[in-house]
């Protein structure tokens, strides 16, 4: 029976900067029941807080809701593991809410053929930014990623869209059905998941020349 | 205890390419963004680039978008800068640094350095 | 970019004194400044973060104060070990970039 091993918080995720959730993973149990309190101060503080809810984001996590998320200050915060027989602490984490932004995927995907009588046909692709991000208040700017491939097909055909909601794609198999893909990331943050798929049936008469 | 080993020290010509590695230990490779920073002899830092783990995603000094890879491989939690079209110029410590935390880049962890001489 | 310029160049300090440093960023940058110490054949050691915030287990004699352009780094007394190259970075806007460094030396 030995106290417990370091434990460690290795990810921060907020879907929209409103709330955020922490999750550690426990050291070595050491052969006891151990507990598990987070601690967190902001910069510029000496007051030690106490996670304010373990039970929203499930085990080994901290969610901070509403009251107790802010922006503009950066979170210092360490884990401690505790048995009969002693103690640890993870190495201190700090954590700015505006960098752990991890979005819903967009949605309404939209995919279309387009066969202008003047120009080559391409396949245009639109979408919408995700429901709980606010985009009119320039908190954030949204860079999105479409991914493409004929159904059979195994590799993806990635395309950096930026910041605009809508793209054409011009260079396509014809008479292949395609899976069409989106996701979105904050200028600072994380990817979101990809989108449910779209399928489109390219026109055997869709030319590239 | 948090790590960054590099590897060691490269004589390269002109026009030749290098990569230099950063292996990480101590913590989990995907949490935190991996930043490399140079020193040339007897002159300050300049920011290269850096690159999150988790997918790879990276941001470079438009100054080196030409030239500079940064790749990472999980399963070895190392990171890799590769620079290309060699001049004497680049000779200089090519550092990686760990970002200080899950927010701006400021660089907590920094590995020993790794000397790049440039000579034909 | 955002060109950060540190002076003086070299100070020369004797042991037990206070040190002023400091570093004047060429745009707007908020709070977003760094200071790093840097010692011969050594990688650089944060100090301050976000202007004014010393960083886990930094003595209580390095502060950093400033904001919007100039930023300060003071050592309220000098020990032997502080003797080294200090720079401060912003990272306000791409790319992260530093300053030219202020030596301090042992008067």
């Known amino acids: 029976q030995l106290p417990p091993g370091k434990p460690e918080i290795f990810k921060c995720r907020s879907p929209n900067k409103e709330t955020f959730t922490c999750w550690w993973r426990p050291g070595t149990d050491g052969g006891l029941p151990t507990n598990y309190s987070l601690t967190y101060h902001r910069e510029g503080e000496t007051l030690m807080h106490e996670c304010p809810d373990y039970i929203t984001g499930g085990p080994n996590s901290c969610h901070f809701g509403k009251q107790y998320t802010s922006m503009w200050r950066t979170y210092i915060m360490m884990v401690n593991a505790t048995n009969q027989m002693g103690s640890s602490f993870s190495d201190e984490l700090y954590v700015d809410v505006t960098y752990i932004v991890q979005p819903d995927p967009p949605l309404e995907l939209a995919v279309e053929v387009k066969q202008p009588e003047d120009r080559k046909p391409y396949l245009w692709i639109k979408w919408s930014p995700p429901t709980l991000i606010d985009l009119k208040t320039g908190w954030f700017t949204l860079l999105y990623e479409i991914r493409l491939k004929p159904e059979k097909a195994a590799e993806w055909e990635i395309h950096f869209a930026g910041q605009q909601t809508e793209f054409k794609i011009l260079s396509l198999h014809p008479g292949q059905k395609y899976l069409v893909q989106v996701r979105c990331k904050p200028d600072h943050g994380y990817w979101s998941a990809w989108s449910p798929a779209t399928f489109i049936q390219i026109p055997s008469d869709f030319t590239m020349n | 205890e948090v790590q960054l080993v590099q590897s060691g020290a490269e004589v390269k010509k002109p026009g030749s390419s290098v990569k230099v590695s950063c292996k990480a230990s101590g913590y989990t490779f995907t949490t935190y963004w991996m930043h490399w920073v140079r020193q040339a002899p007897g002159q300050g830092l300049e920011w290269i680039g850096e690159i999150d783990p988790s997918d790879s995603y990276s941001n470079y000094n438009q100054k080196f978008k030409d030239r500079a890879t940064l790749t990472v491989d999980k399963s070895t939690s190392t990171a890799y800068m590769e620079l290309s079209s060699l001049r004497s110029e680049d000779t200089a410590v090519y550092y990686c640094?760990?970002?200080?935390?899950?927010?701006?880049?400021?660089?907590?962890?920094w590995g020993q350095g790794t000397l790049v001489t440039v000579s034909s | 970019e955002i060109v950060m310029t540190q002076s003086p160049a070299t100070l020369s300090v004797s042991p037990g004194e206070r040190a002023t440093l400091s570093c004047k960023a060429s745009?707007?940058?908020?709070?977003?400044v760094a200071w790093y110490q840097q010692k011969p054949g050594q990688a650089p050691r944060l100090l301050i973060y976000?202007?004014?915030n010393r960083y886990t287990g930094i003595p209580a004699r390095f502060s950093g104060s400033g904001s919007g352009t100039e930023f300060t780094l003071t050592i309220s007394s000098l020990q032997s070990e502080d003797f080294a190259v200090y720079y401060c970075?912003?990272?306000?806007?791409?790319?992260?970039?530093f300053g030219g460094g202020t030596k301090v030396e042992i008067k």
């Open positions: 976000s202007a004014s």
């Open positions: 970075q912003q990272y306000s806007s791409y790319p992260w970039t």
């Open positions: 745009q707007y940058v908020g709070t977003a």
């Open positions: 640094a760990r970002n200080g935390g899950l927010g701006p880049a400021w660089f907590s962890y």
